[in-house]
């Protein structure tokens, strides 16, 4: 044996964002022919013997960071990369505005601003089929996300979420979705390969993306840090990316 | 009540060969992982081996590895450890310990140890 | 030599508040593992003492306490006793090749 055995996948189906009471799975995935693995839930102490985590109803207490390795031979695999299991609808939505307004002219300027009741000091911002995040100020109570000589490809549908720092597994509701629109051009924004939001398709999680393979990034301006959230990395080269632009204290 | 009880300390010269046993009792042993942990005398304590609870998963201290074989009955409620090449440093007393499980998960700790059994190795 | 990182001894006066360190790395405590602490009294097998970096089992009094923080974590002990006299063990998980590891141990005399 030259080197240590490479880490395996750790994915969660159908999105790392799991509304409470909803279902997941976890999936750890290691070459062919390993049986052996331990998938762990980091800061518990505690671990289990399979691969597979099938939650039937997301909770408070299974929210965290998640770990999995597999044993062959006596030799353990080097661990997966961390997936961060986040419970959403824990907290009440908070509510989403574009200003001046959700219609902007191409060229213009535009600022997104995710706003709450609570005194949360994080917010994550997410764009269907977004490549990229933006950097944002910080706010307390409220976080702007400003959209600097927006472009047709800044068209689309957005939510937010709010969390607290303290609990960062534990997010509200998404808010509800604002559709943004470029106008003054002709060129057409990328889409999701799916029909058109729709209030009742909880931000695609249950609906059109469950066999969408996607690549969640969590940014947070505080560490600059980049975390892959959800890593489903390339069995979809069609599938959309979801960004979430978290904005710390 | 949860109860481990070793056994098959002694007196061993080096070189030989030593199988220890911890027997439990009160509660469902097929459900979890079980483990040795040792004392050299004076000194502090010094995790050995575990095995998982279906006898699957098995781990080693990089300090016995190769020597030292973990295994367990679980029609019988018994873990063992049979102890091969046995040396001076090896000299402890053994406890078997339990670790906590709730549900599906298991944990990286201890919650019931056994009172430990004497091994020596001299000659 | 012990992977977490203890002190040999501690000691206080009965009533007296003590603590005890507990310095892992970052395969270990800081790889995300708890902190368990075990109490070894004289001549007996350890008992679980605190779990989960801060939990007590049943029947542990509410003058032991622990933390944990980035590599290290501590136990710290209220209103000491004479019957707290025994030796404390600190135990986490580490990364490398899955193994449990153990402090080196902290004896605590009262004064």
């Known amino acids: 044996q030259s080197g240590p055995l490479p880490k395996p996948s750790l994915q969660a189906l159908p999105s790392s964002l799991v509304p409470l009471e909803k279902p997941v799975t976890l999936r750890c995935q290691g070459p062919p022919g390993v049986d052996l693995y331990r998938l762990e839930k980091l800061s518990s102490s505690r671990y289990q013997d399979q691969a597979v985590l099938f939650i039937p109803a997301m909770k408070r207490s299974l929210a965290g960071r998640y770990r999995c390795s597999y044993q062959n031979g006596s030799l353990w695999s080097l661990p997966s990369d961390q997936l961060e299991l986040v419970a959403t609808g824990v907290f009440a939505k908070p509510s989403l505005s574009a200003q001046p307004g959700p219609a902007v002219s191409s060229g213009g300027d535009v600022t997104l601003q995710c706003q709450t009741r609570y005194g949360f000091d994080q917010f994550a911002l997410y764009k269907e089929g977004d490549p990229a995040p933006y950097k944002n100020p910080e706010r307390w109570y409220r976080a702007s996300f400003p959209i600097i000589t927006v472009t047709a490809a800044h068209s689309g549908t957005y939510r937010c979420y709010s969390f607290s720092s303290r609990d960062p597994y534990l997010w509200s509701a998404p808010s509800d979705p604002l559709e943004l629109v470029v106008t003054g051009t002709s060129v057409t924004p990328s889409r999701l390969p799916t029909e058109p939001p729709s209030p009742v398709a909880e931000f695609s999680e249950a609906t059109a993306e469950l066999t969408v393979s996607f690549t969640n990034e969590v940014f947070t301006t505080e560490t600059s840090r980049s975390i892959t959230a959800s890593p489903k990395e390339s069995d979809s080269p069609a599938g959309p990316a979801r960004q979430y632009y978290t904005k710390g204290n | 009540q949860v109860q481990l009880v070793e056994s098959g300390g002694g007196l061993v010269k080096p070189g030989g060969s030593l199988r220890l046993s911890c027997a439990a009792s009160?509660?469902?042993?097929?459900?979890?992982?079980m483990s040795w942990i040792r004392q050299a005398p004076g000194k502090g304590l010094e995790w050995v081996s575990s095995?998982?609870?279906?006898?699957?998963?098995?781990d080693y201290a990089a300090s016995v590895k190769g020597r030292f074989t973990i295994s367990r009955d679980n029609a019988k409620n018994s873990l063992y450890l049979q102890m091969n090449s046995l040396r001076a440093e090896d000299t402890a007393v053994y406890y078997c310990?339990?670790?906590?499980?709730?549900?599906?998960?298991?944990?990286?700790?201890?919650?019931?140890w056994g009172q430990g059994t004497l091994v020596t190795v001299s000659s | 030599q012990s992977v977490l990182t203890q002190p040999p001894s501690v000691s206080g006066a009965p009533g007296q508040r003590v603590t005890i360190s507990c310095t892992g790395s970052?395969?270990?405590?800081?790889?995300?593992?708890?902190v368990h602490w075990y109490q070894q009294l004289p001549g007996t097998a350890p008992k679980l003492l605190i779990y989960?970096?801060?939990n007590r089992p049943s029947g542990v009094p509410d003058r032991f306490s622990g933390s944990k923080s980035g590599t290290s974590a501590s136990l710290a002990i209220t209103g000491l006793q004479a019957e707290d006299e025994a030796d404390y063990y600190c135990q986490s998980h580490d990364l490398g090749a899955h193994v449990w590891v153990f402090g080196g141990g902290t004896k605590l005399t009262v004064l």
């Open positions: 310990a339990r670790h906590y499980r709730e549900f599906r998960w298991h944990y990286y700790y201890f919650d019931y």
């Open positions: 095995v998982g609870s279906e006898g699957k998963f098995i």
């Open positions: 009160g509660f469902s042993f097929s459900d979890h992982y």
């Open positions: 970052s395969s270990n405590i800081g790889a995300g593992y708890d």
């Open positions: 989960g970096n801060s």
